[in-house]
């Protein structure tokens, strides 16, 4: 049995149509263990592509050495050289370029808009619950609870600015101290990094692309988690963030100024407000224990209202509640008093889709969640395709060199810091770290930006989002100015501290190594990416939340053994890799544990069993849609089903399941990984529902 599926008798004489590029380079031993166990001999590695029927099929030659999967791919320039084009061709090429740019900007616009709508959808689905998290009085005494509330609320509302503004309102209203607010801000920082991780999941189709994209997204997660791991205990012990920010706030005599500039929102708001508009004050009101807010809808109905202060007769339970004794009376049934009542008159309804539907928040939220995820996914696919077609040959080389090359010696170390500044600046322009890091993710995936360069850009993004918060704080009204500024500064110094911990010395750039590790695992077992997302952003925070509610004794009772086991495993892992000889023979590897405790292979088999039935219909559907899409646009290879579907076909053919001969619009590319580079023993278990 061959290690990759062969194309049967698709063509009677393939040599007429195919130019082979073979290399006799042996597969390295460490990789060969991943390939099919029945055939690990030296294999001529061939990559071939069936080109459109109107052209002579030629094989694109590629370097075939089994290199570092983290090396950026060489994006081939398959087009005709500029010098070889005639005048008409050159004009056409220019127009194509402009067209692609317009399309790219269009899809980028809808990508950003869909992120905004996604945030609104999450707020509609989980906003009220998120608000109730804040109304828990234990936050005051338990920083760990504050942290997980920050994570959960930000994950539920998909917006760190929403959770931060709730915290600011609560601090301003003395419902929360700055000390209690700091862990929540740290949690919000973690929660905001879920957005680009979700975006990375959209690139699950191509294994190598997904490896890079997922690692590039999770580098943000790991930076935030590690920063909190170190800085939360430091803050609890020393209160350095609280003290430093208090000194800064007290040393300035601030006057609240202009509103923080809305830059990207100026372009996106006109579109997103046609889809849905939310009354975000409702979440804050719930957080501040306002019972009436629990029955209010988050969907804004009236956009133009007239607020008038009027004296009104209102009933009071007793004379003690009167505004003044002489302004109280009874009609014989109730006690009445005169109060200044703010009367809101509705003038004009909002102009969005859901204004007249009167659907419950949950229904609107679910509808928007599905739509925004579909648009997000569609835009991402199109952005990747357009970038893929643009970033070829010379253009790719120039861009890659510009972005990823360091300054000449001895200033190479400055490059990263410039990237931090660029990240901060870009985030300030788009006014959202989620938008910036989410836009970065596909670029990492397709190999335009290395993870090493994406890391400082992401760190800069973290700084950028706090500068926006500081500006917003300076523009806030007098009663909230101090608290909002102090909280914004806490956020700023927390990120600065994190950068000082995990960036200046290359050795300390742990988030990169951790993200790459996770990228490798997720590329091999794609279900693990979703598993990671659920565990880190939902299960762990919810578990800690539950244990915290049960009280300190329970939290410590469960937490200490768990932390002890984690430390033990980490120490053992470190010794196994650095100096295994100091360990007894049995502890030099993890084989003493059951397989399911140190390998994902058994879990993969289980998950494949569950997701298997959904794969074939899904891939079938994809092929049909793809064919229709290609027929409509008249391009024979504009659309290609995900690698996942091809892996599935290959796995079946390897087991003797006949696979149809390629048709006109099929674009079958057999890559190194299909030949065993990152293949599990049973290719059937490789492809999951993802």
């Amino acid at each position: 049995m061959a290690p990759w599926p062969e194309l049967g008798d698709a063509q009677p004489n393939p040599s007429k149509y195919l130019e082979g590029a073979t290399s006799q380079q042996p597969i390295t031993p460490d990789k060969s263990k991943e390939t099919n166990k029945t055939d690990n001999t030296e294999v001529p590695v061939t990559k071939f592509e069936l080109l459109p029927t109107y052209s002579t099929a030629t094989l694109i030659e590629e370097p075939t050495e089994v290199d570092d999967p983290w090396n950026l791919p060489t994006l081939q320039d398959s087009g005709i050289k500029w010098s070889e084009r005639d005048a008409k061709g050159k004009i056409l090429c220019v127009f194509q370029g402009i067209g692609r740019l317009i399309l790219l900007l269009g899809f980028l616009y809808f990508f950003v808009c869909s992120l905004d709508v996604l945030s609104s959808a999450f707020q509609l689905v989980g906003g009220k619950m998120a608000g109730q998290f804040f109304s828990n009085s234990s936050i005051m005494s338990n920083p760990l609870l504050g942290l997980v509330i920050g994570v959960l609320v930000t994950v539920f509302v998909q917006s760190s600015s929403t959770s931060t503004s709730i915290v600011v309102s609560m601090v301003a209203s003395s419902l929360l101290t700055v000390r209690a607010a700091i862990p929540i801000i740290m949690g919000a920082n973690i929660g905001t990094s879920i957005t680009n991780t979700i975006v990375a999941l959209m690139q699950v189709g191509d294994r190598s692309e997904f490896r890079r994209a997922f690692a590039g997204a999770t580098v943000h997660d790991f930076f935030n988690w590690l920063s909190v791991l170190v800085l939360l205990p430091v803050e609890v012990a020393t209160h350095y963030l609280e003290v430093v920010t208090q000194l800064i706030v007290e040393s300035f005599h601030f006057k609240n100024g202009e509103d923080a500039p809305d830059l990207l929102k100026v372009i996106t708001k006109p579109f997103t407000k046609l889809i849905v508009q939310l009354d975000k004050k409702v979440i804050s009101q719930i957080a501040m224990n306002d019972e009436t807010a629990k029955n209010k809808s988050l969907v804004k109905i009236w956009c133009k209202t007239f607020t008038n202060m009027t004296q009104m007769n209102v009933t009071v339970p007793s004379m003690a509640n009167c505004t003044s004794h002489s302004l109280c009376w009874t009609d014989g049934i109730q006690i009445w008093t005169m109060k200044n009542v703010t009367y809101k008159e509705n003038i004009a309804k909002c102009q969005h889709i859901f204004v007249n539907f009167h659907l419950p928040d949950l229904a609107v939220g679910i509808i928007l969640l599905i739509i925004s995820l579909l648009v997000l996914c569609g835009c991402l696919i199109m952005i990747v395709k357009i970038l893929g077609s643009v970033l070829k040959g010379q253009v790719a080389t120039v861009i890659k060199k510009t972005i990823n090359t360091d300054f000449p010696f001895p200033f190479a170390w400055l490059t990263g810091y410039l990237a931090i500044l660029v990240g901060a600046g870009m985030t300030f322009i788009v006014q959202s770290s989620s938008v910036f890091t989410s836009a970065l993710t596909p670029l990492i995936g397709i190999g335009v930006i290395t993870i090493e360069r994406a890391y400082p850009l992401t760190l800069g993004s973290n700084i950028g989002t706090t500068t926006t918060a500081i500006l917003a704080a300076l523009a806030s009204p007098g009663n909230t100015l101090r608290s909002s500024l102090q909280i914004a500064l806490c956020h700023f110094f927390f990120n600065i501290s994190g950068i000082l911990l995990w960036y200046p010395i290359p050795f300390t750039r742990l988030p990169i190594r951790m993200a790459k590790g996770l990228g490798n695992i997720s590329a091999k077992y794609r279900w693990f990416a979703v598993f990671y997302l659920i565990i880190f952003f939902f299960l762990i925070p919810l578990t800690v939340f539950g244990l915290s509610l049960a009280g300190w004794p329970v939290l410590v009772g469960v937490g200490v053994p768990v932390v002890f086991i984690i430390i033990l495993v980490l120490c053992l892992r470190l010794l196994q890799s650095r100096c295994p000889r100091v360990l007894p023979k049995k502890l030099q590897n993890w084989n003493f544990l059951p397989l399911c405790m140190h390998s994902l292979k058994p879990w993969d088999a289980v998950i494949s069993k569950f997701t298997g039935p959904f794969q074939m219909p899904c891939c079938c559907c994809c092929r049909v849609c793809c064919r229709v899409c290609c027929l409509l646009c008249g391009c024979p290879k504009c659309c290609r089903c995900s690698k996942c579907c091809q892996d599935l076909e290959e796995g079946q053919e390897a087991q003797g399941v006949p696979v149809k001969a390629p048709e006109t619009f099929d674009n079958i590319t057999i890559s190194r990984e299909a030949q065993g580079e990152v293949r599990a023993p049973d290719s059937k278990t490789e492809c999951t529902a993802l």
Epitope: M319, S326, C328, W329, T330, D331, G332, I333
Partner: antibody, heavy 121, light 107 residues
Amino acid sequence: QVQLQQPGAEVVKPGASVKMSCKASGYTFTSYIIHWVKQAPGQGLEWIGAIYPGNGDTSYSQRFKGKAKLTADKSSSTAYMQLNSLTSEDSVVYYCARGNNYGSPAWFGYWGQGTLVTVSA
Amino acid sequence: DIVLTQSPVTLSVTPGDRVSLSCRASQSIGNFLYWYQQKSHESPRLLIKYASQSMSGIPSRFSGSGSGTDFTLSISRVETEDFGMYFCQQSNSWPVTFGAGTKLELK
């Protein structure tokens, strides 16, 4: 013009209950509160309670809780007061009076003629 | 409950006299005080509302004054039809309460 009509007298046995009426006319019955006031012969006035026919809300003076029950029939524009467990001390005059709109201070611009309740075996 | 104390209990006057009837509240009631006149075998009649506002159809010789805790009903020239009982009532605090009354009689 506004009128409140009450039966002149009611004779009841001790321990029994009486339900006296107050028929309103000349205004919108549901818009004004009806109050009931007790007056012993040669004595002062004592407020018993009030009812707002618009929504049926009632309020009773502490002394008359459980003793008096106020109701109103919108269709006949009539207010009723039922007094339970009557004793000789309840042999007094009971007035109905029209108060103001719901939420306006209580003063009584119009009074019924009063019903004299006589409790005797 | 707010207690209204009326004084004097009985006032004997001759027609043409000027009289002042007093009503004192146990606590401040603003201007939520009303004066009623009740003749023998008749229902009470509202004379003054909100301590000083005369009701329509009430002779101009009746006037009210005061606020807070001390209130006065004045009759500038007593006429024979003015004899009877005079009650004050408050609606500042629940429940509504009446004063015990002042009897205006012929001397």
